[in-house]
């Protein structure tokens, strides 16, 4: 029972984690304009892995995709790759773990096969979580480096008279979503690996012992004990996917005669 619970919980935690990794990868707020100690601008900049956005005080938001591949920083490409690898591994892991769940019976699948699948999915979740954490951490490090570089030249005087304000970026919501999601996926993977140990058949081989009874001879050969694959009481197929409802910032939108976003 404890094994089923551990496996089921590991699956659910990993599912939420992978949903979070997908959400973080798609989010536009990986880096947001630093408003602290900055001149008050009526424009708010934020950037994601795939596009950069600008929200005006009017509420009009304009997003532009990074339509170049070669022109992008290598670090950004690396972060993209890590997140995609994390999602792919996580998705495969989820698929494998569904079939590995103790509460789901598929034909006459052996417990040893389920144990192997559970271990495989667990490892996949661990690697997926590590990829996400690594990706987010690389991006965060990149932000910190750029932040202090831009702070050093916050006001670059042009001829001593005109000042150009450099936009500084700080951690966006997607980084925190990514860290938490990566952590959840990692925890889920560890739980799956722990569950795998409980699922593995414990082969306790005893030597055959002959009991001589009067009249006729009967030999008892106790074999290995196999764990029963009984169904759990909870057979409901619950959907645990968290859609991640986002609340829009309370800003003025601009329903102009020329709306184009």
């Amino acid at each position: 029972m404890a094994v089923t619970a551990c496996q089921g919980l590991g699956f659910v935690v990993s599912l939420i984690g992978i949903a979070g990794i997908i959400a973080a990868t798609c989010m536009d707020q990986w880096s947001t304009q630093d408003l602290y100690n900055n001149p008050v601008t009526a424009v708010f900049n934020y950037q994601g892995l795939w596009r950069s956005c600008v929200r005006e005080s009017s509420g009009f938001t304009e997003c532009r995709g990074y339509f170049t591949l070669l022109g992008l920083p290598a670090m950004l490409q690396a972060v993209r790759a890590l997140m995609i690898v994390g999602i792919v591994l996580g998705a495969i892991g989820l698929l494998v773990s569904i079939f590995a769940l103790k509460c789901i019976r598929i034909g006459s699948m052996e417990d040893s096969a389920k144990a192997n699948m559970t271990l495989t999915s667990g490892i996949m979740f661990i690697v997926s979580g590590l990829c996400a954490i690594a990706g987010v951490s690389v991006f965060a490090n990149m932000l910190v480096t750029n932040f202090w570089m831009s702070t050093a030249n916050m006001y670059t005087g042009m001829g001593g008279m005109v000042q150009t304000v450099q936009t500084r970026y700080t951690f966006g919501a997607a980084l925190f979503v990514g860290w938490v999601a990566g952590g959840l996926t990692l925890i889920g993977g560890v739980m799956m690996c722990i569950a795998c140990r409980g699922l593995a058949p414990e082969e306790t081989n005893y030597k055959a012992v002959s009991y001589h009874a009067s009249g006729h001879s009967v030999a008892y050969k106790p074999g290995g004990f196999k764990a029963s694959t009984g169904f759990g009481s909870n057979t409901k197929n619950k959907k645990i996917y968290d859609g991640g409802a986002r609340t829009e910032d309370e800003v003025q939108s601009y329903p102009s005669k020329h709306d184009y976003v």
Partner: antibody, heavy 118, light 113 residues
Framework: QIQLVQSGSELKKPGASVKVSCKAS????????MNWVRQAPGQGLEWMGW????????TYADGFTGRFVFSSDTSARTAYLQISSLKAEDTAVYFC???????????WGQGTLVTVSS | DIVMTQSPDSLAVTTGERATINCKSS????????????LTWYQQKPGQPPKLLIY???TRESGVPDRFSGSGSGTDFTLTISSLQAEDVAVYYC?????????FGQGTKLEIK
């Protein structure tokens, strides 16, 4: 079409208060931020600040804090500018204007002349 | 606060000729996020409220004749009327829409020579 209709001219004594209204039509009122601009006789335009009609949050320019208050009534689709402790130098035409693309002032009211004289 | 300086203060141009008004800001109005300049041009005729002509330094508002054009980037901007018409006589203002407060230039009075 979008229209902003302001209240009529006001003649006030120094120290009194005045409330200028700006009624909007032709759009969803809470979708547009409302700006207030002052123009003293024969002078240029002076941006006073704006109110986010969705949240009610106001941003004031330097020199327009304290005596000047922006407010809005969503149900009446109206924005208000209240000036207290009026001074002679407050004599001006006050315009309301909506925020547009590029944070520009896209649509303007016809203006309200406030005259402060003893 | 951002200081917006317009030049000249007044300008007299013959009908059909080109009119050019300049506007200089004390800080760059270019937003690196979208590479747009947050500068707006308005036209104000006597006894009327100002009218929006150009936003984002060069984007013409719908309904504005194409003889009006805006250019410039960073701190230096220009409003050009390619062929001056009698109805273009007005005061023209530039405005910073990047930093609070949204300061206006002092205005340029355009007349017909």
């Amino acid at each position: 079409q979008i229209q902003l209709v302001q209240s009529g001219s006001e003649l006030k004594k120094p120290g009194a208060s005045v409330k200028v209204s700006c009624k909007a039509s032709g759009y969803t009122f809470t979708n547009y931020g409302m700006n207030w601009v002052r123009q003293a006789p024969g002078q240029g335009l002076e941006w006073m600040g704006w109110i986010n009609t969705y949240t009610g949050e106001s941003t004031y320019a330097d020199g327009f804090t304290g005596r000047f208050v922006f407010s809005s009534d969503t149900s009446a689709r109206t924005a208000y500018l209240q000036i207290s402790s009026l001074k002679a130098e407050d004599t001006a035409v006050y315009f309301c204007a909506t925020l547009g693309y590029g944070n520009s002032l896209a649509y303007w009211g016809q203006g309200t002349l406030v005259t402060v004289s003893s | 606060d951002i200081v917006m300086t317009q030049s000249p203060d007044s300008l007299a141009v013959t009908t059909g000729e080109r009119a050019t008004i300049n506007c200089k800001s004390s800080q760059s109005l270019l937003n690196s996020g979208n590479q747009r300049n947050y500068l707006t041009w308005y036209q104000q005729k006597p006894g009327q409220p100002p009218k929006l002509l150009i936003y984002w330094a060069s984007t013409r508002e719908s309904g504005v004749p194409d003889r009006f054009s805006g250019s410039g980037s960073g701190t230096d901007f220009t409003l050009t009327i390619s062929s001056l018409q009698a109805e273009d006589v007005a005061v023209y203002y530039c405005q910073n829409n990047y930093f609070y407060p949204f300061t206006f230039g002092q205005g340029t009075k355009l007349e017909i020579k």
